[in-house]
């Protein structure tokens, strides 16, 4: 029988490589029975998660699953880091496996500093 | 009924390189991290890398990083696993396993594929 | 990477014997989820791997209730609390907390 405990589908130590200035829908699958739960969105910084109150968010339906989205118009470059959703149920938390956002910052990825510049910022090369 | 079905063994000469198929069934592949391991005769498991067939993000062994390449076709819910340059201490059984990627649920195996690298 | 010990190589037993492989990891295998993602496989001659325990203590399906998992941190054990003909095999521990995953040398468990 299936459970009817809320379940979120975020892979654990998934990944997501984006370019900043693309538009980007970062989705938290909801597995859900009766009442559709109250679902955040926070980023990691260190151990604590920091809840992202003044976001674009929607829900997306589906026939077995619905989604909260995250959206990201235009991907910044300090959108970079983990996210992880976060659905109350019952007076429960329940958490998602943090999932991880890489950006490419389109413009300093096509002006590459040269190697003088390179040698005079070491802290570059690590 | 769950499976990891593997293309049949290969025999290959030093420096070519072989493509090990897998295709899966039972489960939908993008619920899952496919990963790719092998064995050498008589020897442990070794971690080879692991692809998300969901978005294709793939992690490799520092080992096979430039060498490995694996990939998979969600259509045809089916992992391959490319190695070049292949040298003779590469004779091995290699596996794919799938893991359910969201709350470990399962891990499936595949039967293995023996590729033996040989002049 | 972490490196992953098991003990003993292999182990000689009889059938109906309490059996305990340990695992030893070079770092924490504890993830940010507060999980230690450590496996134990079993594998027979010519056979592929199968995975019997997931998350240090959890019983894949299937899998009898003579084995059992534990352990936390750093170290961890496998136990068969009576031995069955069909147990013996090599089992190895794996981690995929941190990559790259690793898998520990396997102990070989045979028939005394």
């Known amino acids: 029988k299936e459970s009817c405990d809320v379940q979120l589908y975020i892979k654990r130590q998934s990944e997501h490589s984006i370019l900043a200035g693309d538009p980007f829908e970062l989705e938290c699958p909801v597995k859900y029975c009766a009442n559709r739960p109250h679902v955040t969105w926070c980023k990691l910084n260190g151990t604590t998660c920091v809840k992202l109150e003044d976001r674009q968010t929607s829900w997306k339906e589906e026939k077995n699953i619905s989604f909260f989205i995250l959206h990201f118009e235009p991907v910044l470059p300090n959108d970079n880091g983990s996210y992880r959703c976060s659905a109350n149920f019952q007076s429960n938390l329940i958490e998602s496996h943090s999932t991880t956002l890489y950006v490419t910052d389109v413009k300093s990825a096509s002006e590459r500093p040269s190697k003088d510049e390179m040698a005079s910022r070491p802290w570059l090369l690590y | 009924q769950v499976q990891l079905v593997q293309s049949g063994a290969e025999v290959k000469k030093p420096g070519s390189s072989v493509k090990v198929s897998c295709k899966t069934s039972g489960f939908n592949i993008k619920d899952t991290y496919i990963h790719w391991v092998r064995q050498a005769p008589g020897q442990g498991l070794e971690w080879i890398g692991r692809n998300d067939p969901a978005n294709g993000n793939t992690k490799y062994a520092q080992k096979f990083q430039g060498r490995a390449t694996i990939t998979a076709d969600e259509s045809t819910s089916t992992a391959y696993m490319e190695l070049s340059s292949l040298r003779s201490e590469d004779t091995a059984v290699y596996y794919c396993?799938?893991?359910?990627?969201?709350?470990?649920?399962?891990?499936?195996w595949g039967q293995g594929t023996l590729v033996t690298v040989s002049s | 990477d972490i490196q992953m010990t098991q003990s003993p190589s292999s182990l000689s037993a009889s059938v109906g014997d309490r059996v305990t492989i340990t695992c030893r990891s070079s770092?924490?295998?504890?993830?940010?989820?507060?999980?230690?993602?450590l496996n134990w496989l079993q594998q027979k001659p010519g056979k592929a791997p199968k995975r019997l325990i997931y998350l240090v203590s959890k019983l894949d399906s299937g899998v009898p209730s003579r084995f059992s998992g534990s352990g936390s941190g750093t170290d961890f054990t496998l136990t068969i609390s009576s031995l069955q003909p069909e147990d013996f095999a090599t089992y190895y521990c794996w981690q995929d907390t941190h990559f790259p995953y690793t898998f520990g040398q396997g102990t070989k468990l045979e028939i005394k």
């Open positions: 770092q924490s295998l504890l993830d940010r989820d507060g999980k230690s993602y």
């Open positions: 396993a799938s893991y359910e990627g969201y709350y470990e649920r399962f891990g499936y």
